[in-house]
């Protein structure tokens, strides 16, 4: 029960980080023009991954794309990659998340398989909250640097006559929603993962081969651990060997109701 | 067609007040910045300062501030702009504009009040 | 506050001959977020209100006529009038409306020969 909580609770928590990492890739407020200790002007500027826009104090807003590719910074071409990879996998991640659900029964799939479809995405949804993280943070990195040099600009007064109504950049609403998204899908992704040990079996089974003393009789058992599904008295998952040497047949074999004997 | 109508004149005594009108017709009034402008004789235009009625958001000339209140009343569709403590300096005419939608310039003008301050 | 510069004070031309006034502002009215120039020219006829004739330093309000053309980014801007004709007898005045307090200059008054 609680590695089918887990388990959903990962995939919803990646599935709202994922929409965040969208959203946030999509929304033109990456950076918002200063407006403390700056010249009051009677336009906003904004920036997005794909647009710049310009709100005029009516209200008016007029948003151009960038149509260029080779024109644009490494910087945000880097940002725009590591955005659109972390929505790719996490994409891909929730698709596969969804067979992996323990609560949706598909044919006869195995819990090995979903186990490891389970990991698969949760890996997925940690590498694509590390790339949203990441994305965001260049980006923001890239604003402070240019904050900064923008700053001194406006002290030293550009060496010329002419002074410019310098627009300075701080960070916009995209970038918070992206490292809270980026964040959610990493915290998703690693609760998949937690799901998965749940899911798996914890260690090889065994069919063991017992050898008596008194050489009356050789037990095989094929029933090497008893699995938590109810049947018997062993719900703890613990070995159960007779004797003393132990032979290895098989790298899986599956809980039976029995011990033959 | 966007009309707005101001009052021709204002007489008025030295440290008195006036508050002069400018009423909007023929557009949503709440969408445009009301603007405000002095023209003295012989000299040039002066932006006093501007409101948006939508939310009474304001912004002020410096030069103005303690002069000139700018008001509006949405449901009369009118903006309007106390001047205190009037002087001589203070005789002009006043004009209201509105703002344009797409940029920030003043699209449309009203006549104009002549606001003379005599004893 | 910028300071918006205009010259010549006056100027008296021949109806049909071209004329050309500036306007020159003391920081750049150039936005970086849309390349527009935050400068609008205005005519005032005698007696009555100004009335708007381009924005965005080279864009023509609609209903004015093809003759008037902006011209100019940064710091100095221009108003050119192709062809003057009588009914051009006006000032005109160049405004900053990019940065608060929006300024105008003192003007430019065109008389007619």
């Known amino acids: 029960m609680a590695v089918t909580a887990c388990q959903g609770l990962g995939f919803v928590v990646s599935l709202i980080g994922i929409a965040g990492i969208i959203a946030a890739t999509c929304m033109d407020q990456w950076s918002t023009q200063d407006l403390y200790n700056n010249p009051v002007t009677a336009v906003f500027n904004y920036q997005g991954l794909w647009r710049s826009c310009v709100r005029e104090s009516s209200g008016f807003t007029e948003c151009r794309g960038y149509f260029t590719l080779l024109g644009l910074p490494a910087m945000l071409q880097a940002v725009r990659a590591l955005m659109i990879v972390g929505i790719v996998l996490g994409a891909i991640g929730l698709l596969v998340s969804i067979f992996a659900l323990k609560c949706i029964r598909i044919g006869s799939m195995e819990d090995s398989a979903k186990a490891n479809m389970t990991l698969t995405s949760g890996i997925m949804f940690i590498v694509s909250g590390l790339c949203a993280i990441a994305g965001v943070s260049v980006f923001a990195n890239m604003l402070v640097t240019n904050f900064w040099m923008s700053t001194a600009n406006m002290y030293t007064g550009m060496g010329g006559m002419v002074q410019t109504v310098q627009t300075r950049y701080t960070f916009g609403a995209a970038l918070f929603v992206g490292w809270v998204a980026g964040g959610l899908t990493l915290i998703g992704g690693v609760m998949m993962c937690i799901a998965c040990r749940g899911l798996a079996p914890e260690e090889t089974n065994y069919k063991a081969v017992s050898y008596h003393a008194s050489g009356h009789s050789v037990a095989y058992k094929p029933g090497g651990f008893k699995a938590s599904t109810g049947f018997g008295s062993n719900t703890k998952n613990k070995k159960i060997y007779d004797g003393g040497a132990r032979t290895e047949d098989e790298v899986q074999s599956y809980p039976s109701k029995h011990d033959y004997v | 067609l966007v009309q707005l109508q101001q009052p021709g004149a204002e007489l008025v005594k030295p440290g008195a007040s006036v508050k002069v009108s400018c009423k909007a017709s023929?557009?949503?009034?709440?969408t445009y910045w009301m603007h405000w402008v002095k023209k003295r004789p012989g000299q040039g235009l002066e932006w006093?300062?501007?409101?948006?009625?939508?939310?009474?958001?304001?912004n002020y000339n410096h030069k103005f501030k303690g002069k000139a209140t700018l008001t509006v009343d949405k449901a009369s569709s009118t903006a309007y702009m106390q001047l205190s403590s009037l002087t001589s300096e203070d005789s002009a005419v006043y004009y209201c504009?509105?703002?344009?939608?797409?940029?920030?310039?003043?699209?449309?003008w009203a006549q104009g009040t002549v606001v003379t301050v005599s004893a | 506050d910028i300071v918006m510069t205009q010259s010549p004070s006056s100027l008296t031309v021949t109806a049909g001959k071209k004329v050309t006034m500036n306007c020159k502002s003391s920081q750049s009215l150039l936005n970086s977020g849309n390349q527009k120039n935050y400068v609008t020219w205005y005519q005032q006829k005698p007696g009555q209100p100004p009335k708007l004739l381009i924005f965005?330093?080279?864009t023509r309000e609609s209903g004015v006529p093809d003759r008037f053309t902006g011209s100019g980014s940064g710091t100095d801007f221009s108003l050119i009038i192709s062809t003057v004709q009588a009914e051009d007898l006006a000032v005109y005045y160049c405004q900053n409306d990019y940065v608060y307090p929006f300024t105008f200059g003192s003007g430019t008054k065109l008389e007619i020969k």
């Open positions: 023929g557009s949503t009034f709440t």
């Open positions: 504009a509105m703002g344009a939608y797409y940029s920030n310039s003043f699209a449309y």
């Open positions: 965005w330093a080279s």
């Open positions: 006093i300062g501007g409101i948006r009625p939508s939310d009474s958001n304001t």
